[in-house]
């Protein structure tokens, strides 16, 4: 099933996925004046096994005399199997690069891609929130949101973060970028109440979630 909504917006905050669960799809979008190459992939797909995950397919854009008005389509499962596999890896990746089992990293940029990337996430995907420059974080709990399946419906958990209008006290590069934990915290599938614990992404292990897909977009 699709996650019906985008992750919640928090005033004066920005969110980002640090890794993408297997099954995540990314539309191959090109910026104005460019279009996907003929017979090019509609999307990239995060796929793999427990020890290694990578993006299948490669997005490619070519110059276009006319605007690309191709409607984006969410690929069907049978389409996914037929796609050619092309692993995309960024050159010169540091050896200390974090890797999460069952997750893909952000795909490297491709030439003349669209400004915005449109992802189709699976249930269990996490996004992480931080206050934008000039605002300070007041944590009441985890500054993250997880796409969950509850009572047969998908929803995003509410990040427990407030950003106040005081200048951030931490200085670059002292803060640490949150490391994505594989999946969401355990939460009862029979209870509609959301319970959260302290924000400790780096040290927590998490529970396995069902697989479904939703669409969101962020820059």
């Amino acid at each position: 099933e699709l996650c019906d909504d985008d992750p919640p917006e928090i005033p004066h905050a920005t969110f980002k996925a640090m890794a993408y669960k297997e099954g995540t799809m990314l539309n191959c979008e090109c910026k104005r004046g460019f279009r996907r190459i003929k017979s090019g992939s509609l999307y990239m797909l995060c796929t793999g096994n427990s020890s290694h995950s990578s993006w299948d397919n490669q997005c490619q854009c070519t110059s276009s005399a006319t605007r690309n008005t191709t409607k984006q389509v969410t690929p069907q499962p049978e389409e996914q199997k037929e796609r050619k596999t092309t692993e995309m890896q960024s050159p010169m990746q540091p050896v200390d690069q974090a890797s999460l089992p069952g997750h893909c990293r952000e795909p490297p940029p491709w030439e003349n891609e669209a400004t915005e990337r449109i992802y189709h996430f699976v249930v269990g995907q996490m996004v992480y929130y931080q206050c934008v420059q000039g605002y300070r974080a007041l944590h009441r709990g985890p500054a993250e949101s997880v796409c969950k399946m509850t009572h047969g419906k998908t929803r995003w958990t509410q990040p427990q973060l407030i950003c106040t209008g005081e200048m951030e006290t931490s200085q670059f590069p002292g803060e640490e970028k949150p490391q994505a934990s594989p999946e969401g915290r355990p939460e009862s599938e029979t209870s509609c109440l959301v319970t959260t614990t302290d924000f400790q992404i780096q040290t927590e292990m998490a529970a396995t979630m069902e697989t479904s897909i939703f669409t969101t977009e962020y820059q």
């Epitope: 952000e106 490297p108 940029p109 491709w110 891609e113 669209a114 400004t115």
Partner: nanobody, 130 residues
């Protein structure tokens, strides 16, 4: 695949200046933070500076504030790092890197960490003699 190509490194005396340039032909600048890391011999790679390709906001490591200036030319798909008042401690291999912006086209300094960049250049060597 899209590549980042650095240039401008070299040997300079302490107190001198250098201008590094990163060419990113085909990169959609307004979807990324673009900037610089450096790695001195035997040390970890550290973030130096970046510019938000969407809104032009910049950030600098404390060690280079007031001495380094980052700028971009989105039309030419280049990002430059003007390095003034160079010190021996600034000697390192300088790498260009890009990282995807967050929602709303925003970017925060704590994301500018070596393991998490989306794409790297091969680096250019800066040597500062005392």
């Amino acid at each position: 695949q899209l590549q980042l190509v650095e240039s401008g490194g070299g040997l300079v005396q302490a107190g001198g200046s250098l201008r590094l340039s990163c060419a990113a032909s085909g990169l959609t600048f307004d979807g990324y933070a673009i900037g610089w890391f450096r790695q001195a011999s035997g040390k970890e790679r550290e973030g130096v500076s970046y510019i938000n390709g969407r809104d032009g906001s910049t950030f600098y490591a404390d060690s280079v504030k007031g001495r380094f200036i980052i700028s971009s030319d989105n039309a030419k798909n280049t990002v430059d790092l003007q390095m003034n008042s160079l010190k021996p401690d600034d000697a390192a291999v300088y790498y260009c890197a890009v990282d995807r912006l967050g929602s709303r086209g925003a970017y925060v300094s704590s994301w500018w960490r070596s393991p998490d960049m989306d794409l790297w250049g091969k680096g250019t060597l800066v040597t500062v003699s005392s």
